[in-house]
Amino acid sequence: ESGYAQNGDLEDAELDDYSFSCYSQLEVNGSQHSLTCAFEDPDVNTTNLEFEICGALVEVRCLNFRKLQEIYLIETKKFLLIGNSNICVKAGEKSLTCKNVNVATIVKPEAPFDLSVIYREGANDFLVTFNTSHLQKKYVKVLMHDVAYRHEKDENNWMHVNLSSTKLTLLQRKLQPKATYEIKVRSIPGDYFKGFWSEWSPSYYFRTPEINNHSGETNPT
């Protein structure tokens, strides 16, 4: 468990950029947590390089990561989930670079799923619902969600709605009639835990009905 590399310690290693980033996922496999780290530079020669986390662990000093192709992974129950750990890139016993990381503040939730959109004719709106595995979790239960939708012809013109529940109503009059829309959702920790946006859910596509010119009402298509 060595500390930060001192200047002059690294010889040729100093020429390389070993900067890395990590994210945690809590209760991702039952009660097990995961911590995933990867080098920022995909071209780093990772032969003989290892990752190690020390501190803020339950009844152990340090844990070693498993190497899985381009990522380094730990699956464990041994995170205290408070305070800083020291994550180091190591070549043998030598630490090439280290950073202080609080596992509870680099949480990346699991992506939402089962996204669907139901048109409600009487209400002239669309009910958007989705699910998240975090409703069943002990820790990262409080999430903020970002629902993004766009007209399929508007390549980059995404509309965003932030919400804390898993239901959203889109008013029909705010959407173009007789058009196809793409919608997707992602989540970020709220409350005690902090971190990053999840991956996007798979997109869902829905069509808006045409407007009935006589009554001002619309017909779903």
């Epitope: 501190g55 408070i82 800083n84």
Partner: antibody, heavy 119, light 105 residues
Framework: QVQLVQSGAEVKKPGASVKVSCKAS????????MNWVRQAPGQGLEWMGL????????SYNQKFKGRVTLTRDTSISTAYMELSRLRSDDTAVYYC????????????WGQGTTVTVSS | EIVLTQSPATLSLSPGERATLSCSAS?????MHWYQQKPGQAPRPLIY???KLASGIPARFSGSGSGTDFTLTISSLEPEDFAVYYC????????FGGGTKVEIK
């Protein structure tokens, strides 16, 4: 101001259990670990264990594992240390200490609770 | 488990003198902390993360070191500095050294 106030002195018989409380004030109780450190008469300091008040996760010194139990009540910002199967060499001053999670040092200490184990 | 050995066990000095206290670890550690304890009182933090002064600690206290060897220095002893000093390492099981008593010569 930040303060840890511990319960009063205890006298126990060998084989009994003791439960010491530590009431925190002046800070967010769930934001820092609570540690327990003991000091036998004329001796040095010995870390016993810690609890994360937010989730109740504990980490114990192997020397005390199975005999010490750390708990907390977040509604009253109080941590507890229970030591069972007491022996005469458990006679000591028991301190609670707030853990600074950035550097893992104990930045605020309780006043100490004297536990005497004697038949 | 890492063992921290403090030396000397007792340091006899006069007010105004410089005190140098050592803490040696059985293996390399990342951070070392120092505490002061007076009779009948709880320990109080002096130095954290090797060299940072804890809140309210005067600048005559300083810390240094890396790897396995760490030092607490009191540049000029004041009467209130005569006490026992403990080093402690940052990681599980948060081991303390045996202490160095700084006494009046």
């Amino acid at each position: 101001q930040v303060q840890l106030v511990q319960s009063g002195a205890e006298v126990k018989k060998p084989g009994a259990s003791v439960k010491v409380s530590c009431k925190a004030s002046g800070y967010t109780f769930t934001g820092y670990t609570m540690n327990w450190v003991r000091q036998a008469p004329g001796q040095g300091l010995e870390w016993m264990g810690l609890i994360n008040p937010y989730n109740g996760v504990t980490s114990y010194n192997q020397k005390f594992k199975g005999r010490v139990t750390l708990t907390r009540d977040t509604s009253i910002s109080t941590a507890y240390m229970e030591l069972s199967r007491l022996r005469s060499d458990d006679t000591a001053v028991y301190y609670c200490a707030r853990g600074d999670g950035n550097y893992w040092y104990f930045d605020v200490w309780g006043q100490g609770t004297t536990v005497t184990v004697s038949s | 488990e890492i063992v921290l050995t403090q030396s000397p066990a007792t340091l006899s000095l006069s007010p105004g003198e410089r005190a140098t206290l050592s803490c040696s670890a059985s293996s390399s550690v990342t951070y070392m902390h120092w505490y002061q304890q007076k009779p009948g009182q709880a320990p109080r933090p002096l130095i954290y993360e090797i060299s940072k002064l804890a809140s309210g600690i005067p600048a005559r206290f300083s810390g240094s070191g890396s790897g396995t060897d760490f030092t607490l220095t009191i540049s000029s002893l004041e009467p209130e500095d005569f006490a026992v000093y403990y080093c402690q390492e940052w990681n599980y099981p948060y081991t303390f050294g045996g202490g160095t008593k700084v006494e009046i010569k």
